[in-house]
């Protein structure tokens, strides 16, 4: 045998070159058949009507094929026939890739709650062989599974993701990302999540700076209310008590004038939107006007949200004594 | 020149043989496939059968398949057709044809000779 | 078994255009070969593949070919021209080679 060919793989629409190659030449002929057996090339004579098949060299040793715009339907083995005697035959297989179709990322809630496990589903249509898919959450990757179906050769993937959502997550891309022999480079579609969560409640003392209250001061709260809707409601109680007469309720802010150490107590911040509620309180001590220079002290902000239980961490600005740690039922 | 000659025609018995042969001159006969055509009185042409120039591959018609076989003799530049079991259909004037590409495009054509088959 | 068709005859003046016409299965795929035969001579190639004029052929003489029809065209037709012409393809995917039943043609002088 000393008729030899090459397998050739090409992606779809692309151009295929088939060659027959001679090593012993004796001036026998050369024909190359396609994989219904039609002559394509007859030494350097094309009988067959496709013109999609060209020739690129045809000598004793070599005849050379090109076949431009590669289908499908083009894939399986071309014969190459040398006219001695007796007769010899080689075959050379054409494999057709073929790049996904189509890429699409479906989602099956536009707006998710935190918490919630949502489906995500991936396809990517048409391709051969079977498209790979992966999943990212962000630069995180996930892991779905995947469904394969057959049509005629060609292969449609879905793959399925099952998310559980947090409020980090809001914002954050769903990346679909297929590998392919046929892809070069990145081949991905995305979707952002969007992920609704109830109110993050944080407390800031504005005034006095430098944290420590004191009779016939003024205090100055502001309550940050983060959440997804932003929160429509941010309301100022004290905890057990009234609010005091002398204070000033001005959207997310809390003013109150002159303290006196009646005003002590747990002051709270509520903010509500349609996930759910959440709090922060911040406990008020109100101490004596100084006399001499003022003991160094500091107040931090505490903040909650909601659970069954939440545990609240109060810092008290009284000299000397250590914050404790309390249980608060809502 | 280019010249195919063919010889061997006469008139024949059905169920009798008969071997026609065909002298190539002026080409390099080992490099083309050759083929036998007939043409009945008054009809059309009829491709009966062909050989690869080296030999090793021959093709037939199926109205004279089992019947007739083609070879040919690449020292003497000679094709032959071995016809048995003649019958009065196989009656014509055979001609022998050089494929310019195979049997695509028979470039080069013979005078023909008379094959007679009749009681 | 395939076979390729071909109309009985067709007259033309001399200098007119006339047109032969091929039909046939096998024709989807390969381009035919077209011969002329005059009386009492063998065939003689004059068209073939999807443009070849041997040499010595006047260029009058064309083909084409589309779906399952082939046509052989003589562009101002001469009075040699009038002589039988067939069509000639492979059969399919066997290796088998057909005719069609050939189309006289007729000059008028």
């Known amino acids: 045998q000393n008729l030899f060919t090459k397998d050739v793989t090409v992606i779809e629409g692309e151009v295929a070159t088939i060659s027959c190659q001679v090593n012993k030449s004796d001036d026998s002929v050369i024909q190359l058949l396609n994989p219904n057996r039609q002559t394509i090339y007859f030494r350097d004579f094309r009988p067959l009507k496709d013109s999609r098949f060209q020739l690129l060299n045809f000598s004793s040793s070599e005849l050379k094929v090109s076949l431009t715009n590669v289908s499908i339907s083009d894939e399986g083995r071309y014969f190459c026939q040398l006219y001695t005697d007796p007769p010899q035959e080689s075959y050379t297989t054409i494999t057709v890739l073929v790049p996904p179709r189509n890429l699409m990322i479906d989602i099956q809630r536009d707006t998710a709650v935190e918490g919630e496990e949502i489906e995500v589903n991936c396809t990517a249509m048409a391709s051969k062989p079977a498209t790979t898919i992966r999943w990212f959450k962000g630069n995180t990757e996930l892991k779905g599974k995947s469904e394969v179906e057959e049509w005629s050769d060609m292969y449609t993937v879905t793959s399925q993701l099952m998310l559980k959502v947090h409020k980090e997550d809001d914002g954050v891309p769903v990346i679909c990302q297929v590998e392919h022999p046929a892809v070069t480079g990145n081949l991905q579609t995305q979707r952002y999540l969007e992920v609704q969560y109830k109110p993050q409640v944080h407390i800031q003392m504005t005034y006095p700076l430098q944290g420590l209250t004191r009779e016939g001061d003024a205090l100055e709260l502001t309550c940050e209310a983060i959440g997804k809707p932003q929160p429509v409601m941010v309301t100022w109680v004290r905890v057990d008590d009234e609010m005091p007469q002398h204070a000033v309720l001005s959207g997310p802010n809390l003013f109150i004038n002159n303290l006196n150490k009646t005003d002590n107590g747990t002051y709270r911040c509520e903010a509500s939107n349609i996930v759910g509620k959440a709090h922060s309180d911040y406990m008020l001590y109100v101490y004596d006007p100084p006399t001499t220079i003022p003991p160094p002290t500091t107040t931090t902000t505490t903040t909650t949200t909601t659970t069954t239980t939440i545990l609240t961490i109060i810092t008290d600005s009284r000299a000397g004594e250590e914050g404790s740690i309390r249980a608060v039922d809502h | 020149e280019v010249q195919l000659v063919e010889s061997g025609g006469g008139l024949v018995q059905p169920g009798g043989s008969l071997r026609l042969s065909c002298a190539a001159s002026?080409?390099?006969?080992?490099?083309?496939?050759m083929s036998w055509v007939r043409q009945a009185p008054g009809k059309g042409l009829e491709w009966v059968s062909g050989?690869?120039?080296?030999?090793?591959?021959?093709y037939y018609a199926d109205s004279v398949k089992g019947r007739f076989t083609i070879s040919r003799d690449n020292s003497n530049n000679t094709l032959y057709l071995q016809m048995h079991s003649l019958r009065a259909e196989d009656t014509a004037l055979y001609y022998c044809?050089?494929?310019?590409?195979?049997?695509?495009?028979?470039?080069?054509w013979g005078q023909g000779t008379t094959v007679t088959v009749s009681r | 078994s395939s076979e390729l068709t071909q109309d009985p005859a067709v007259s033309v003046a001399s200098g007119q255009t006339v047109r032969i016409t091929c039909q046939g299965d096998?024709?989807?795929?390969?381009?035919p070969s077209w011969y002329q035969q005059k009386p009492r001579q063998a065939p003689v190639l004059v068209f073939f593949?999807?443009?070849n004029r041997p040499s010595g052929i006047p260029d009058r003489f064309s083909g084409s070919a589309s779906g399952n029809t082939a046509s052989l065209t003589i562009a101002g037709a001469q009075a040699e021209d009038d002589a039988d012409y067939y069509c000639?393809?492979?059969?399919?995917?066997?290796?088998?080679?057909?005719f069609g039943g050939g189309t006289k043609v007729t000059v008028l002088g």
């Open positions: 050989i690869s120039g080296s030999g090793g591959s021959t």
């Open positions: 002026g080409f390099t006969f080992r490099s083309y496939t």
């Open positions: 096998s024709l989807r795929h390969y381009y």
């Open positions: 000639s393809s492979r059969d399919g995917n066997d290796d088998r080679w057909l």
């Open positions: 044809a050089r494929g310019l590409y195979g049997l695509y495009a028979m470039d080069v």
């Open positions: 593949g999807e443009n």
